[in-house]
Interface confidence: low
């Protein structure tokens, strides 16, 4: 996250790490007691490594009571995801068992009605992500504010040039922003789950290149076939 | 179309080695989980092994853990079983069988089998 | 482990007729059902998966239902070429397990 702050330690009890190997890979989201949102590009940096999700973390190296890694039973990516491109950029993780819920680990609700959050309004996005151009990764869950951009705006050639579609959002990016590491984590308005971090290798922070999200409304039936 | 053929299968005495190979064709290879699973004469199939499509992730029943080893070479398209410390009761036919895309753990393809005899 | 209890072992039928199997799981395994099919001296063949998915071309007749944590398989106008032993499968957690099979014969 970039230009935002430490977050309220465990105030997102919905927040997961994707982890491979040990290390922070991805953001991702608990949207069922047995289910994590996340990016399916994460998958491909995934490699051979073995991958595990994170629950009810703030600081990634202390010890923290709420804190738990789970294997991944089941990994299932968007049948359409492809490598070359950010559509459908997103993979649903099965935890190898139920989560035990608790204050600091709680699904978060998402967003089933398919329709543009308003632009301009303020949504909130998280995650482990890097936190200077330098690359510099935190160790403490970080957040920012962000206005929601229109699809219109975000279009225009100076900007994401139509890649834009109706199953994305976006979200102003000028010094305040994802980024690199907050890939699969969620951009939450009013405490419901609207968008995912895209995980393509956008440029960070800077205003022409708003932050893409993947709209979770628009895959409602598909999250409803896996999860069932 | 999908082609999955076994081979390495044979004779072994007990306590003894073998590697079984899985040469797959006609799907991408590397998007699939796949597993391993036996078939002793005249009973039903039980799945021995899973290895994900990235290799991630390794499944084995109870009896074979510790004996048995999958894993895959996605350049290859090629799945492998190593099986050591062989017993009688591990005699079978087995199966490679392609895993449902994405993790959706059911076997949607499967080769015709090598015969593993574990006998002295 | 998840156990699979599946009825009847064997099962004697007529041309034509309508035929059930029943797997039951010893908990929950929400829709990750498989039936596979396997004809004397064959491979087993996947039938239905995810309780009631008809496979790459698996005739209609195939069907299959899920009610809680019972599971069936029908086979409508059962036809020759159906005899063979039967099998599920659950699918939601490791160790994957089977059913012991139904046999399925012609009266």
């Known amino acids: 996250i970039l230009g935002g702050r430490e977050a309220e330690a465990h105030a997102r009890p919905y927040m997961a790490s994707v982890q491979v190997n040990g290390e922070h890979l991805c953001g991702g989201v608990l949207v069922a007691e047995q289910w994590v949102l996340s990016a399916a590009h994460c998958l491909e940096d995934a490699a051979d490594g073995k991958v595990q999700v994170l629950l009810g973390a703030h600081s990634l190296s202390q010890p923290e009571p709420s804190k738990r890694l789970y294997d991944v039973l089941r990994a299932v990516p968007h049948p359409d995801s492809r490598p070359d491109t950010i559509d459908h950029d997103l993979l649903l993780l099965q935890l190898s068992e139920k989560a035990t819920l608790g204050p600091a680990v709680r699904p978060l609700p998402w967003q089933r009605v398919d329709r543009d959050v308003e632009p301009g309004t303020l949504c909130d996005v998280a995650g482990w992500g890097i936190v200077s151009h330098a690359g510099r990764r935190p160790d403490r869950l970080q957040h920012v504010l962000l206005p929601v951009l229109d699809r219109a705006t975000c279009n225009r050639r100076t900007h994401h040039d139509g890649a834009i579609t109706q199953r994305m959002m976006c979200a102003e990016s000028n010094r305040r922003d994802s980024c690199k590491g907050d890939s699969g984590g969620p951009l939450v308005c009013g405490g419901v789950l609207e968008g995912v971090v895209t995980s393509g290798s956008r440029v960070c922070g800077n205003r022409k290149k708003p932050g893409i999200y993947t709209r979770v409304a628009s895959y409602a039936a598909w999250i409803d076939s896996v999860l069932a | 179309e999908v082609k999955l053929v076994e081979s390495g299968g044979g004779l072994v005495q007990p306590g003894g080695s073998l590697k079984l190979s899985c040469a797959t064709s006609?799907?991408?290879?590397?998007?699939?989980?796949m597993a391993w699973v036996r078939q002793a004469p005249g009973k039903g199939p039980e799945w021995v092994a899973f290895i994900s499509n990235l290799a991630y992730s390794f499944y084995y029943v109870d009896i074979v853990m510790g004996r048995f080893t999958i894993s895959r070479e996605n350049a290859k398209n090629t799945l492998y079983l190593e099986m050591s410390s062989l017993r009688s009761e591990d005699t079978a036919m087995y199966y490679c069988a392609r895993v449902g895309l994405y993790g959706n753990f059911f076997m949607d393809y499967w080769g015709q089998g090598t015969s593993v005899t574990v006998s002295s | 482990d998840i156990q699979m209890n599946q009825s009847p072992s064997s099962l004697s039928a007529s041309l034509g007729d309508t035929i059930t199997i029943t797997c039951h799981a010893s908990?929950?395994?929400?829709?990750?059902l498989s039936w596979y099919q396997q004809k004397p001296g064959n491979i087993p063949e996947l039938l239905i998966y995810?309780?009631?998915n008809l496979h790459t071309g698996v005739p209609s007749r195939f069907s299959g239902n899920r009610s809680g944590t019972s599971f069936t398989l029908t086979i409508s106008s059962l036809q020759p070429e159906d005899i063979g032993t039967y099998f599920c499968?659950?699918?939601?957690?490791?160790?994957?397990?089977f059913g012991a099979g139904t046999k399925l014969e012609l009266r």
């Open positions: 499968q659950q699918g939601q957690s490791y160790p994957l397990t």
């Open positions: 995810k309780a009631s």
């Open positions: 908990q929950n395994i929400n829709v990750w």
């Open positions: 006609g799907f991408t290879f590397s998007d699939y989980g």
